[in-house]
Interface confidence: medium
């Protein structure tokens, strides 16, 4: 994570900065949500535990044609050590529960806020 590429400036970005920027983007999504996010698309719910960044990306990458979450998808890929492609699933998905993207983003934001407060940047 220490080599994560930043959006504001080139070069390495500290994990705390990367997490803060991800939180800021999720806040921005929730703030500017006028119509249903991604036309109300549904995604697999995930367990918000270790490895959740990859799991979150695996869920969101299956949403296509939604520009509102493209930046989030790019940011999450920086946190995930392996390449993620559509249709890929990890054990962290709650495979029997699908939720709207908007709710997924809110849940993820809530959890990331907690991690940031606790100083868990990795």
């Amino acid at each position: 994570l220490t080599c994560l590429g930043g959006f504001a400036s080139p070069g390495p970005v500290p994990p705390s900065t990367a997490l803060r920027e991800l939180i800021e983007e999720l806040v921005n999504i929730t703030q500017n949500q006028k119509a249903p996010l991604c036309n109300g698309s549904m995604v697999w719910s995930i367990n918000l535990t270790a490895g959740m960044y990859c799991a979150a990306l695996e869920s969101l990458i299956n949403v296509s044609g939604c520009s509102a979450i493209e930046k989030t998808q790019r940011m999450l890929s920086g946190f995930c050590p392996h390449k993620v492609s559509a249709g890929q699933f990890s054990s962290l998905h709650v495979r029997d529960t699908k939720i709207e993207v908007a709710q997924f983003v809110k849940d993820l934001l809530l959890h990331l806020k907690k991690l940031f407060r606790e100083g868990q940047f990795n």
Epitope: R20, E24, F116
Partner: antibody, heavy 121, light 107 residues
Framework: EVQLVESGGGLVKPGGSLRLSCAAS????????MNWVRQAPGKGLEWVSY????????YYADSVKGRFTISRDNAKNSLYLQMNSLRAEDTAVYYC??????????????WGQGTMVTVSS | DIQMTQSPSSLSASVGDRVTFTCRAS??????LGWYQQKPGKAPKRLIY???SLQSGVPPRFSGSGSGTEFTLTISSLQPEDFATYYC?????????FGPGTKVDIR
């Protein structure tokens, strides 16, 4: 010492403009989101505007939208508020306040001392 | 927009009293709430963040609790320097909103 110092306040006529500055010291300014908050004489606190660390996200209160512009210069450790089309109801003490991450974390932990803006003919 | 209400709007108390203020949000703000103390002519000072965490350097007689829509600030034993106005702030979503404040004066 962590410090925020506002400047630029003063007396201005209705319809006029003013630019407020907030100089930060004692912390890594570029790592913090920033806000402007105001307080009319004898009244409560009102949030005015927010700017994220790298200028990516900016929000305004409805009462100032289209008239006020928030900006920052991380190289100069400075926050600004450009106020145009000023009205009598903009008369207030203006504070800058530090934020961890907008709308999420531990907002407004450090405040400046404030600068007074008076809009009157 | 999220509305914040505070009660009481003012109270008279004596040194040594236990005082409690309430702040209510018009919708769920999780724990995105801070409490601030302001004295005349001075900038606000943060006492509590994340609804219940004590700001560094703030005396432990101040405590916060609550989450969701209802929050409280308690001063366990009021001191002379505590006579001031207290505001709550929600920073869960924009526009950020402050409560109207509770003024504490000497009985």
């Amino acid at each position: 010492e962590v410090q925020l110092v506002e400047s630029g306040g003063g007396l201005v006529k209705p319809g006029g403009s003013l630019r407020l500055s907030c100089a930060a010291s004692g912390f890594t300014f570029s790592s913090y989101s920033m806000n402007w908050v105001r307080q009319a004489p004898g009244k409560g606190l009102e949030w005015v505007s927010y700017i994220s660390t790298s200028n990516s996200y900016i929000y305004y209160a409805d009462s100032v939208k289209g008239r006020f512009t928030i900006s920052r210069d991380n190289a100069k450790n400075s926050l600004y508020l450009q106020m145009n089309s000023l009205r009598a109801e903009d008369t207030a003490v203006y504070y800058c306040a530090r934020d961890q991450v907008g709308a999420t974390l531990d907002a407004f932990d450090i405040w400046g001392q404030g600068t007074m803006v008076t809009v009157s003919s | 927009d999220i509305q914040m209400t505070q009660s009481p709007s003012s109270l008279s108390a004596s040194v040594g009293d236990r005082v409690t203020f309430t702040c209510r949000a018009s919708q769920d703000i999780t724990d995105d709430l801070g409490w601030y103390q302001q004295k005349p002519g001075k900038a606000p000072k943060r006492l509590i963040y994340a609804a219940s965490s004590l700001q560094s350097g703030v005396p432990p007689r101040f405590s916060g609790s609550g989450s969701g829509t209802e929050f409280t600030l308690t001063i366990s034993s009021l001191q002379p320097e505590d006579f001031a106005t207290y505001y709550c702030l929600q920073h869960n979503s924009y526009p950020f909103t402050f409560g109207p404040g509770t003024k504490v004066d000497i009985r």
